[in-house]
């Protein structure tokens, strides 16, 4: 071996200088009487080597690297050998940092594994092999005086936690615990923890269970859940407080916390929840009032709250068949009385015959908002309820009475926009209790079964805005009926469009008489369409062969018109425009020719 490198230190702080010397023995100088020693760090040649011949004939080169910025590199001492570089010796250099003080040291006592598990954060990377040791001792007091040392706990490589087994622990007695970090550049120690392993106990959570329904126990109220929890048996004797968290399974709701709760709740009713909703529940506990750590959250329990009976008002309206007055069509609308009024599963219409205590005869059971049934001859009243699995709404009585109340007057309707109509009236005297407003397509598409209806509870109302099922260019029939205490008034109706169409076509023009300079025209007006706005006027247009146009406006009641001042023997094109407020439509064009000067008048 010809050469040998020695370094000031093989491991230094990252960025620090390092000095190295390379000595080449005399017996190697046959390579070259004055060999030039070269330095290489990694793959790069390093200038700055100072070379000298020593008294014993050996050659020495010394180099100082001002900053070692590689965490690991090989420093080589070389000679040129022909065209290649011959490495005589090399050393591994390492650079890094002394260990930072380990921080956030914390410990948990696990009663299942009977060990104290401590973990820490090692701090920034040192770039050097660094060992961590969990050190501890037993202490009688508050760790000021050190008792028996406990065997060091050395974590597996790369781990920042270590378990002290039970045989090295003393429960209900303090232990001093710290972490020592060590590498070639130094040693550091974390702040010392002083703890009784039982004060850092982490329990297992209880197991949540649903309450088995017992025959004598009342079922949970709507929006409530009955549950219980089975404490973790090994922690049964440890006083604990627990907390429950719950959230609806659907939606984005966050967890709601309930606590503190006792560990030993034989049963617990959780209320204030949404009815008929699936919930996820979890529980966790902590040693208390003595110190401890929260357990993990328990496995989830999934439970559904019971629903509440519908809390709705049912607005009702009915119609009798004209051909069979005992056949009644009953309509209703549920109006929620509370924000959460309960799910409605269906509706039942029933009748209680007089003199039959308790006997209730169902007339129909439906999920629709109407039903048709035959009213028994002695029945003057039926009851309507909404129901679900939790019960029924309060019954709504429906009394079938004659129209004996006063009628409203001056019923009128006007368009608000293409999708709404305002219907107004003058209230009768005395004031009704309210009104039923029905609307649906008028003739020719009229149908009793397709009517929309609304209840107006305010008897002093003088109008109502119809916003449902209103489309432009359709004729609507609107029926308003006043409602009184035990009866109703006669129904009134009106027709209206929310947006009218222009007349669909104008009358055909016919030539009645013609002369040399005049022509008499006539037409048959279109029959008025019910509810369509009437024609406001006609305009007649005529054009001569020279393309000169003339027109005249006629009132809507006109049936004919005479064109004067025409040229004899001339061709004219004539058409009629029928106009209403909604627009205008042209007739087909009539073409005629006036008579020649020598011709006789045609009548």
């Amino acid at each position: 071996e010809c050469g040998h490198i020695s370094v000031s230190a093989p491991i230094v702080h990252l960025g620090d200088p390092i000095t190295a010397s390379c000595i080449i023995k005399q017996n190697c100088s046959h390579l070259d009487p004055e060999p030039q020693i070269l330095w290489r760090l990694g793959a790069e040649l390093q200038p700055g080597g100072r070379q000298q011949r020593l008294s014993d004939g050996t050659q020495e080169s010394i180099i100082t690297l001002p900053h070692l910025n590689h965490t690991q590199a090989f420093l080589s001492c070389c000679l040129n050998w022909g065209n290649s570089l011959q490495i005589l010796d090399q050393v591994e250099l390492r650079a890094g940092y002394p260990p930072a003080i380990p921080h956030n040291l914390s410990c948990l006592m696990n009663l299942t594994t009977s060990s104290l598990i401590c973990q820490w954060e090692p701090g920034p990377e040192t770039h050097l092999p660094t060992s961590f040791t969990l050190k501890s001792f037993k202490s009688r007091g508050n760790c000021q005086t050190q008792g028996d040392s406990i065997l060091d706990c050395v974590p597996k490589d790369g781990q920042s936690h270590c378990c002290i087994p039970r045989k090295h622990l003393l429960l209900y007695q303090n232990m001093g615990i710290w972490v020592q970090a060590e590498n070639a550049l130094g040693t550091s120690m974390s702040p010392q923890l002083c703890l009784d392993p039982m004060d850092v106990v982490k329990l297992e959570p209880p197991m949540l269970r649903t309450m088995d329904p017992s025959p004598e126990a009342a079922p949970p109220q709507a929006g409530c859940l009955q549950l219980c929890w089975e404490p973790w048996q090994p922690g049964l004797h440890i006083n604990q407080k627990c907390e429950l968290r719950h959230k609806p399974q659907r939606g984005e709701a966050s967890w709601a916390l309930v606590g503190p709760l006792p560990l030993e709740a034989l049963q617990y009713e959780l209320c204030g929840l949404l009815p008929a909703t699936a919930y996820t529940l979890q529980i966790r506990c902590i040693r208390w009032p003595l110190p401890g750590h929260w357990s993990d959250w328990s496995p989830s329990l999934e439970l559904r709250t019971t629903e509440r009976a519908p809390t709705v008002r049912l607005d009702t309206w009915w119609r009798q068949r004209q051909l069979d007055p005992r056949t009644v069509q009953l309509f209703w609308k549920p109006v929620p009385l509370e924000e959460d009024s309960g799910r409605i599963q269906g509706y039942v219409v029933s009748w209680r015959p007089s003199g039959q205590a308790g006997a209730i005869l169902p007339l129909c059971n439906t999920t629709e908002l109407s039903c048709t049934f035959h009213l028994p001859s002695e029945a003057q009243e039926v009851a309507l309820v909404a129901y679900n699995s939790a019960g029924t709404s309060r019954p709504t009585p429906v009394v079938f009475s004659e129209s004996r109340g006063p009628a409203l007057t001056r019923l009128h309707a006007m368009a608000r926009d293409p999708h709404s109509l305002w219907v107004g009236w003058e209230p009768p005297n005395p004031w009704p209790q309210g009104y039923v407003i029905e609307w649906g397509l008028g003739p020719p598409s009229a149908s009793n079964s397709n009517k929309t209806w609304r209840m107006e509870q305010n008897g002093r109302a003088t109008g109502f805005l119809l916003k449902e099922n209103i489309r432009p260019f359709q004729l609507y029939e609107i029926i308003v009926t006043p409602l009184y205490q035990d009866t109703m008034g006669p129904s009134q109706h009106v027709y209206a469009y929310s947006q009218e169409m222009a007349p669909s076509h104008a009358p055909e023009l016919h030539l009645k008489h013609i002369g040399k300079t005049w022509a008499q025209l006539e037409w048959v007006p279109e029959p008025p369409e019910l509810g369509k706005s009437p024609l406001t006027h006609y305009t007649i247009f005529w054009t001569n062969a020279q393309n000169q146009s003339f027109s005249a406006i006629l009132n809507a009641s006109s049936r004919g018109f005479v064109l004067h001042g025409l040229e004899p023997a001339s061709l004219y094109h004539i058409h009629l425009m029928a106009a209403s407020q909604a627009g205008a439509t042209n007739s087909t064009v009539l073409t005629l020719m006036t008579l020649t000067p020598e011709g006789s008048e045609l009548h």
């Epitope: 009663l111 049964l236 004797h237 006083n239 030993e264 709740a265 034989l266 009032p289």
Partner: antibody, heavy 118, light 107 residues
């Protein structure tokens, strides 16, 4: 210093009833589980029943289930054992014990003798 | 139920002897094993809890070991006051059965 003092033992006929009491002092009674252990003459120790700090959990040995009732009055620092339908095999010294957090019986009373005999 | 079996049921030993008593659980009980000492006519006294923790005031010649199902109580050097009956008990769940006891007598 923890002190537990049992009372209420004595002679009772089979089928009879007896109520044992255990007066506790020297510790915060309401924070600890308590229990009863018995020892028949010349025999080993037999766990009878325990009660949680608030009284909500009360496990029993199969041999006494349905006949004995454990209870406590935290305001009086007193533990009770109501024994009904007593049998000859219930004859024993009954010890009251304070339980630790890991279920161990940390402190014991001096015991009270219950004799069931006709 | 977890049954506890102690052995031997009795043993004779001399002062200064090292004495070992074993206790076996019918199923794993982690470290939830306690040892009690009872002298004739007296109430039992807790010696060791949670398998190896010495109760305050108990001499250090007493030690406990084991976990799971097999446990040992060791008296490193028997003293005259140690002649008594020793019981093990599991406390991981109810019913909290005791072992049958081991009577340590003077040889």
């Amino acid at each position: 210093e923890v002190q537990l003092l049992e009372s209420g033992g004595g002679l009772v006929q089979p089928g009879g009833s007896l109520r044992l009491s255990c007066a506790a002092s020297g510790f915060t009674f309401s924070l600890y589980w308590m229990g009863w252990v018995r020892q028949a003459p010349g025999k080993g120790l037999e766990w009878v029943s325990s009660i949680s700090s608030s009284g909500g959990v009360t496990p029993y040995a199969d041999s006494v289930k349905g006949r004995f009732t454990i209870s406590r009055d935290n305001s009086k620092n007193t533990l009770y054992l109501q024994m009904n339908s007593l049998r000859a095999e219930d004859t024993a010294v009954y010890y009251c014990a304070k339980l630790g957090e890991l279920g161990m019986m940390q402190s014991w009373g001096q015991g009270t003798l219950v004799t069931v005999s006709s | 139920d977890i049954q506890m079996t102690q052995s031997p049921s009795s043993l004779s030993a001399s002062v200064g002897d090292r004495v070992t008593i074993t206790c076996r659980a019918s199923q794993g009980i982690s470290s939830y094993l306690n040892w009690y000492q009872q002298k004739p006519g007296k109430a039992p006294k807790l010696l060791i809890y949670y398998a190896s923790n010495l109760q305050n005031g108990v001499p250090s010649r007493f030690s406990g070991s084991g976990s799971g199902t097999d446990f040992t109580l060791t008296i490193s050097s028997l003293q005259p006051e140690d002649f008594a009956t020793y019981y093990c008990q599991q406390s991981i769940e109810y019913p909290a059965h005791f072992g049958g006891g081991t009577k340590v007598e003077i040889k």
